[in-house]
């Protein structure tokens, strides 16, 4: 690595992977085993992030990018950047401070993650009930009675509808 | 009548990025789910990534995990999906669907199915 | 590979039942709704079946879809040769957190 010759600030010279080594005279210094410099012109590198325990390397630190962590299986991810790992629970549960709980009767969860949520309301749209609901899926909301012919064998979705029964978790 | 229709597709290097568009119409943008979903030439098609209208959130298939990101603009009436660290497996033909089952009413909309979709916009990463 | 394993092809004549098999898991097909989309040659897919066996309005009453544990049906009956196609079957899996879609049957109307 060359000696930075800026008029102005010589870390600016610095690229990212590198740091203005001020013991150095400030020179660009690559960063140390276990660091990183995600821009350049920086005094110091970051200490790379490490995926412990619960969490699991998803991609490795290099000198220029962080770690990133992801959950071991029956875990996974919440906040920025995967901060922590909550347990999984099977479909039709919900994460309770007691553990995994089943949906009580009107709600679903077709997730693994969050919570048991109330089933659709069909009337709300004036619709009727196509198909019942359970503890892991909605219900399914079929045209109005009035809409439907003498004999129709099968209705189409309210209008455009939402889609999977994810609910953000 | 819904409309979709996806731009910002193309030829990128290995490695390269490409942001895609789908500008939708004929029904309430912000009430529905959306979706990529991409073919490869004579390949079957594989799910992409949702997002949801309401809380914004998201979901990826494991292939593309880390390297793309969706999001949305409920006052453009506009999906997008950007795509990083693109690989030669990415090249494909790109849908943007609409999901069934119109939020808040609809709680989930996995039963409904993708019943709108676009033309397609072709990615082809080579090198 | 695919989550949702659908026959590569399927094939009959022009008035003719035939039916298309997509065998899941109890995190897929049997615990969530299985929708059909249909794929004409060199157009963008549609939605033919959801919620298991329901039909979009516009979708003809030949098309209809079954499921039962873990494996799902789509059966075209009356056969025509507009139905020459590539059929999918598709269903969130709550595992993956995530959509899944079968690899798709070619029908061939001989």
């Known amino acids: 690595f060359e000696r930075t010759r800026s008029l102005q600030d010589p870390c600016s010279n610095c690229p990212a992977g590198t740091f203005c080594d001020n013991n150095r005279n400030q020179i660009c210094s690559p960063c140390p085993p276990n660091s990183f410099s995600s821009a350049g012109g920086q005094r110091t590198c970051d200490i790379c992030r490490q995926c412990k325990g619960v969490f699991r390397t998803r991609k490795e630190c290099s000198s220029t990018s962080n770690a990133e962590c992801d959950c071991t299986p029956g875990f996974h991810c919440l906040g920025a950047g995967c901060s922590m790992c909550e347990q999984d629970c099977k479909q039709g549960q919900e994460l309770t401070k007691k553990g995994c709980k089943d949906c009580c009767f009107g709600t679903f969860n077709d997730q693994k993650r969050g919570i048991c949520r109330p089933w659709t309301n069909c009337s709300l749209d004036g619709k009727s009930v196509l198909v019942n609901g359970t503890k892991e899926r909605d219900v399914v909301c079929g045209p109005s009675p009035a809409d439907l012919s003498p004999g129709a064998s099968s209705v189409t979705p309210p209008a455009p509808a939402r889609e999977p029964g994810h609910s953000p978790q | 009548e819904v409309q979709l229709l996806e731009s910002g597709g193309g030829l990128v290097q290995p490695g390269g990025s490409l942001r895609l568009s789908c500008a939708a119409s004929?029904?309430?943008?912000?009430?529905?789910?959306m979706s990529w979903v991409r073919q490869a030439p004579g390949k079957c098609l594989e799910w992409v990534s949702v997002i949801y209208p309401d809380d914004g959130n998201t979901y990826y298939a494991d292939s593309v995990k880390g390297r793309f990101t969706i999001s949305r603009d409920n006052s453009k009436n506009t999906l997008y999906l950007q795509m990083n660290s693109l690989r030669a497996e990415d090249a494909a033909v790109y849908y943007c669907?609409?999901?069934?089952?119109?939020?808040?009413?609809?709680?989930?909309?996995?039963?409904?199915?993708?019943?709108?979709w676009g033309q397609g916009t072709l990615v082809t990463v080579s090198s | 590979q695919s989550v949702l394993t659908q026959p590569p092809s399927a094939s009959g004549t022009p008035g003719q039942r035939v039916t298309i098999s997509c065998s899941g898991s109890s995190s897929n097909i049997g615990n969530n709704y299985v929708t059909w989309y249909q794929q004409l040659p060199g157009t963008a897919p549609k939605l033919l079946i959801y919620?298991?066996?329901h039909r979009p309005s516009g979708v003809p009453d030949r098309f209809s879809g079954s499921k039962s544990g873990t494996s799902a049906s789509l059966a075209i009956s009356g056969l025509r040769s507009e139905d020459e196609a590539d059929y999918y079957c598709a269903t969130w899996d709550y595992s993956l957190s995530g959509y899944v879609f079968g690899c798709g049957t070619k029908l061939t109307v001989l």
């Open positions: 669907a609409k999901h069934g089952g119109q939020k808040p009413t609809t709680k989930s909309s996995s039963a409904y199915g993708m019943d709108g």
């Open positions: 004929g029904f309430t943008f912000s009430g529905y789910d």
């Open positions: 919620a298991d066996s």
